[in-house]
């Protein structure tokens, strides 16, 4: 067309993909008349009538735009719906009358593309690649136009570098006509970079202005050799038996060498290898004295078959022994003495500590216990505590019986138990004494003894009431190698009318229990003797 | 130191009796017990029968109940087996031995052998 | 009576060797934690020795090699590294109560 290079610039309408363009017709009224206009859609040089106007009214020509065309504004604008990326292209207006004059317009259409997505090479990167290695890919699906890609190192933008690092971006065109763009992030890393974050931004634009959007951050597998491997061992501090204790080997490469854990024999003074869980650690479960030695770890690298020895480490898990108590079942006549010692090994200070057993009273501070001018009260069970101070639940204990000679002594000397005749008794009577005594009855009846303890026995009578019974009573007579001792139940009969017994006697209708620990004018007291036992 | 020493053994006539002595000293000898036990040649050992030399009680085995009597002199501290009505199967070893309450036996003499023969 | 069976009646071995000797009763010879067993070891010609008391309780004067163990029935006398003088007969004895008995013997030699 003669003249077209001093033609103006076109109107720019632009407009995001799927909305409606208005082309408005910019021709003047001096320039030709609005109410007959030819519109044309020009791509690649060659005109396109899409839609005639005449007398006002609108009419499309078949083809792409045969649907999507109408006449606005009383006929001065065409609006196209539904545009497409292929849209992008100059529309002109074309008046008749007077002359011929047209007005361009250049449509640009636009679509921001989708969220970037980002991929990290899972393979991961060895920092000593000869030439830059692919990080990560970025894609950016169903823009338009192109967006363009910056890459990001620690919220730093990455530029190419020749050898060091190189960006490779391609784009497809899907059949919508919007683009998808795949950018390749390929670089030499440095150990430092393990941490790294990497992210892509897409920037675009859009008819409201420049726009981008961020994909999330991530971080890619680098690989590199190991320098040093070293123990590590929970909990930190000290250890003592019973604890659960973890030992790990860790390594400052990527990936981990192959660990293990070894163990210095003591005897040999050869390593000794460990048996560690899948994890590579090793657990003391309980931990105990043995375990405590000189640990190191060897990682292997099975690649290159280098192995690296860590700095050997010492644990120590603290214990405190069995306590043994000498003489361990000590047997001592009456005003005599007794020394009472307690020892116990241990990897620390040891503290001792003597406790009456009964009633938890200390005695004594030290692990001598000296006790003098005995008296038969001063049986029973001693207690020596062996603890570590400094670490707090470490002790072990050990209960000593001490038994005093002498002969039995009753745990009640007299007792009242209310019966009703032809009722079956159950009777019971407890004496102790050292050597332990046994325990026999003045009436028949079906008796049984149990021991209580080393010093301690408890006789149970099943006895029927009889009037002759209601007369004597009942006698328990406890007797040892040193003596013998008696105790005496008085049988009064119950009183169904008038009954409000007092709280020192049993009472029963078909079966009555004088039990030693109801006491019932008694000129002795009881106790107990506690069994012997070490426990830590 | 706390001794036993067992004195009377040696070759006697069946039917015939004997009284053994088991002499203590270097403890108080009424605050222990004294038992005696056998053991015949080759064979294990059996407990005969134990006296507190404090009360004069007595224990015995049933086995040898009316056969063996225990008696002490306290003056003398010294602690009898007397055995009546012998015969070959009373050959044996005799000690005396001194417990405690719990009757584990920490000292024992050093034993008189008992032959039954004619 | 309570019968006491020991296992085995001799075993062969070695100085150095870790031995062990069990006893059962017929019944219980346990009270509340006391438990009234006792080993002793006998020599030929000699009167027996006290090893152990109340099961485990080692009397004084005793090496340390010699521990004793268990409750109620079964009991272990335990001699951790032999050495020449522990080749001898050794006797459990109960006095959970009357009459007391012994077991009929490990006799240890030397393999």
């Known amino acids: 067309v003669p003249g077209e290079a001093e033609q103006p610039a076109p109107e720019l309408v632009e407009v995001e993909v799927g909305s409606t363009a208005l082309l408005k017709c910019g021709l003047s009224q001096s320039q030709g008349n609005l109410s007959h206009v030819d519109w044309f859609s020009v791509h690649k040089e060659k005109r396109t009538l899409i839609f005639r106007v005449r007398q006002g009214q609108g009419q499309s020509e078949p083809g792409e735009y045969e649907q999507r065309l109408s006449l606005q504004d009383r006929g001065a604008t065409l609006a196209l719906t539904q545009v497409t990326p292929q849209d992008e292209r100059i529309f002109l207006c074309q008046g008749k009358r007077p002359r011929s004059q047209e007005y361009r317009i250049q449509l640009r259409v636009y679509k921001a593309p989708e969220e970037p997505n980002i991929q990290v090479n899972p393979l991961g990167i060895p920092v000593n690649s000869k030439e830059p290695e692919e990080v990560a890919t970025c894609v950016g699906r169903n823009g338009y136009p192109i967006p363009q890609v910056i890459w990001y190192k620690n919220g730093r933008p990455l530029k190419e570098e020749k050898n060091r690092v190189h960006i490779q971006s391609s784009q497809t065109v899907e059949s919508s006509g919007l683009y998808t763009l795949q950018s390749i992030l390929k670089a030499q890393l440095v150990k430092e970079d393990k941490d790294a974050q990497f992210y892509c931004e897409l920037n675009y634009r859009l008819p409201s202005g420049n726009h981008m959007k961020e994909s999330r951050e991530v971080t890619v597998p680098v690989f590199y050799p190991t320098e040093k491997v070293w123990l590590e061992v929970e909990p930190v501090g000290m250890l003592k038996e019973g604890d659960r204790v973890e030992i790990r080997c860790l390594a400052d490469g990527n990936p981990p060498p192959h660990f293990s854990i070894s163990k210095q024999n003591p005897s040999t003074r050869e390593a000794e290898e460990e048996t560690t869980n899948d994890n590579g650690v090793l657990v003391l479960e309980p931990a105990r004295k043995e375990h405590s030695g000189r640990y190191e770890c060897q990682g292997l690298d099975l690649d290159t078959m280098i192995s690296l020895l860590s700095e050997p480490q010492e644990l120590l898990v603290n214990y405190v022994s069995d306590v043994r108590v000498s003489p361990a079942a000590p047997e001592r006549q009456e005003g005599s003495s007794l020394t009472l010692t307690c020892e116990a090994e241990s990897s620390q200070d040891l503290e001792f500590q003597w406790l009456r057993e009964e009633t938890g009273q200390v005695l004594e501070r030290g692990p001598v216990l000296q006790l003098h001018d005995l008296k038969r009260e001063a049986g029973g069970g001693y207690r020596c505590v062996a603890s570590v101070p400094s670490i707090p639940g470490l002790n072990r204990t050990q209960l000593v019986n001490v038994a005093i000679f002498g002969p039995p002594w009753m745990a009640f000397k007299e007792r009242k138990v209310w019966v009703k005749e032809n009722m079956v008794l159950n009777l019971s009577c407890e004496a102790s004494g050292h050597p332990r005594p046994t325990i026999s009855w003045n009436v028949n009846g079906t008796a049984s003894e149990q021991d209580q303890d080393p010093q301690r026995v408890l006789s149970t009578l099943n006895v029927l009431v009889t009037p002759e019974l209601l007369e004597t009573g009942v006698e328990c007579t406890a007797s040892n190698d040193l003596g013998k001792n008696t105790s005496i139940l008085f049988l009064e009969l119950v009183n169904l009318t008038t009954l409000t017994p007092d709280s020192n006697t049993t009472t029963g209708l078909s079966t009555s229990t004088a039990s030693p620990h109801t006491r019932a004018n008694s000129t002795s007291t009881e106790r107990k003797l506690p069994e012997p036992e070490s426990r830590g | 130191q706390v001794q036993l020493v067992e004195s009377g053994g040696g070759v006697v006539q069946p039917g015939r009796s004997l009284r053994l002595s088991c002499a203590t000293s270097?403890?108080?000898?009424?605050?222990?017990?004294i038992h005696w036990v056998k053991q015949a040649p080759g064979k294990g050992l059996e407990w005969i029968a134990r006296i507190y030399p404090g009360t004069d009680i007595t224990y015995y085995n049933e086995k040898f109940k009316g056969k063996f009597t225990l008696s002490v002199d306290k003056s003398k501290n010294t602690a009898y087996l007397q055995m009546n009505s012998l015969r070959a199967e009373d050959t044996a070893v005799y000690y005396c031995a001194r417990s405690g309450g719990y009757w584990y036996f920490d000292v024992w003499g050093a034993g008189t052998m008992v032959t039954v023969s004619s | 009576d309570i019968q006491m069976t020991q296992s085995p009646s001799s075993l062969s071995a070695s100085v150095g060797d870790r031995v062990t000797i069990t006893c059962r009763a017929s019944?219980?010879?346990?009270?509340?934690?006391?438990?009234?067993m006792h080993w002793y070891q006998q020599k030929p010609g000699k009167a027996p020795k006290l090893l152990i008391y109340?099961?485990?309780n080692l009397e004084s004067g005793v090496p340390s090699r010699f521990s004793g163990s268990g409750s109620g029935t079964d009991f272990t006398l335990t001699i951790s590294s032999l050495q020449p003088e522990d080749f001898a007969t050794y006797y459990c004895?109960?006095?959970?109560?009357?009459?007391?008995?012994f077991g009929q013997g490990t006799k240890l030699e030397i393999k």
């Open positions: 109340l099961a485990s």
């Open positions: 270097g403890y108080i000898f009424t605050n222990y017990w």
């Open positions: 019944k219980s010879v346990s009270i509340s934690g006391y438990s009234y």
């Open positions: 004895q109960h006095s959970r109560e009357l009459p007391y008995t």
